[in-house]
């Protein structure tokens, strides 16, 4: 694979990974498909410190991260551990709750307005981040 | 110059392959997703196939999932459309082009090659 | 997969005349709306994304307005070089999908 050394044009560093700011929205899965033909993912948060780094960049707006449950547990899009890894849910969430009444439940994650995490339904366009890290040879991910 | 050049249309049966070629040149081909996009004679433009900088995400129309498969190889600044079993319904003009990027997250085709024609028939 | 739908099909104005094309989405697509022209024997050419924002080089007199599910390409003036068949897509849902296309013809 190739290896990136510095991050694109529009692309912010920080802690050798390089993030780029949505400014408008998609549901999740079309910004899981924007990042990943930008050979990124949609944000994985692995520590508080990258939380606050994220947070300051996004603002008090509904943005979408690399976490979902569409196939049962949860995941983290780069295949970080959930269950061990970093999270920030908001009180009594995630809810898989169904009473939006657009079918289904809420398999999604996003950075609320306080930067604390929602679970919500995936289809909602909110703006996202995607991440890519520096110096590190690109992976060959599955075939979407 | 910036510009895309492809190569490799042709005529061939109902169920044959084929494979289509793009070179790419005066940009820096690996830091952009590519994709293809047809007309058939006479018809409007379809989404084909896109692939990322590095050709680790590929992507395809439905119409075309599991017989045409889009790779590149950065080395040579060239894009491919491999076509299997290709039908009477893929008869078109294949362009190759580059997908440019917004600020606010969109992707468009920004930079077109003048386009190889594929027959499909007996 | 989202529909996009021109209108009208054929456009038959005169060199000089204003042309209004529009462009409507099945579901809203944001802002995530492209146009192109393509003349005869020629491959498209990006003329506004974002639904209003001018690719390189394209000259003034074509402006893009919309959001949502309605759009609209305007020729201020139409130059005898822009007579051609112009789309619209979009970017907003995979697949990628464009308009069947309005011909802009001489009257």
């Known amino acids: 694979g190739s290896e990136r050394t510095c991050c694109p044009v529009n692309w912010v560093e920080h802690e050798r990974s390089c993030y780029w700011f949505s400014r408008s929205g998609k549901a999740w899965a079309d910004a899981d498909n924007y990042c990943r033909l930008e050979d990124a993912h949609l944000v994985v948060v692995t520590s508080w410190e990258e939380q606050k780094f994220v947070q300051h960049h996004i603002g008090p707006v509904n943005t979408w991260m690399g976490l979902h449950d569409q196939n049962g547990p949860w995941k983290w899009v780069d295949g970080t551990d959930y269950e061990t890894g970093f999270k920030n849910w908001r009180p009594e969430q995630p809810d898989d709750w169904y009473g939006h009444g657009l079918g289904g439940g809420e398999d999604c994650a996003h950075f609320t307005d306080d930067g604390r995490w929602n679970d919500d339904v995936c289809q909602r366009p909110y703006r996202w981040v995607c991440e890519t890290e520096l110096d590190k040879a690109s992976q060959e991910p599955p075939l979407l | 110059e910036v510009q895309l050049l492809e190569s490799g249309g042709g005529l061939v049966q109902p169920g044959g392959s084929l494979r289509l070629s793009c070179a790419a040149s005066?940009?820096?081909?690996?830091?952009?997703?590519m994709s293809w996009v047809r007309q058939a004679p006479g018809k409007g433009l379809e989404w084909v196939s896109a692939?990322?900088?590095?050709?680790?995400?590929?992507y395809y129309a439905d119409s075309v999932k599991g017989r045409f498969t889009i790779s590149r190889d950065n080395s040579k600044n060239t894009l491919y459309l491999q076509m299997n079993s290709l039908r009477a319904e893929d008869t078109a003009v294949y362009y190759c082009?580059?997908?440019?990027?917004?600020?606010?997250?969109?992707?468009?085709?920004?930079?077109w090659g003048r386009g190889t024609l594929v027959t499909v028939s007996s | 997969e989202i529909v996009l739908t021109q209108s009208p099909a054929t456009l038959s104005l005169s060199p000089g005349e204003r042309a209004t094309l529009s462009c409507r989405a099945s579901?809203?697509?944001?802002?995530?709306l492209a146009w192109y022209q393509q003349k005869p024997g020629q491959a498209p050419r990006l003329l506004i994304y974002?639904?209003?924002k001018r690719a390189t080089g394209i000259p003034a007199r074509f402006s893009g307005s919309g959001s949502g599910t309605d759009f609209t390409l305007t020729i201020s003036s139409l130059e005898p070089e822009d007579f051609a068949v112009y789309y619209c897509?979009?970017?907003?849902?995979?697949?990628?999908?464009f308009g069947g296309g309005t011909k802009v013809e001489i009257k």
């Open positions: 082009a580059k997908l440019g990027t917004t600020v606010s997250g969109g992707h468009y085709f920004d930079l």
């Open positions: 005066g940009f820096t081909f690996s830091s952009y997703a």
């Open positions: 692939i990322s900088g590095s050709g680790g995400s590929t």
């Open positions: 579901q809203s697509v944001s802002s995530y």
């Open positions: 974002d639904a209003s």
């Open positions: 897509q979009q970017d907003s849902n995979h697949p990628l999908t």
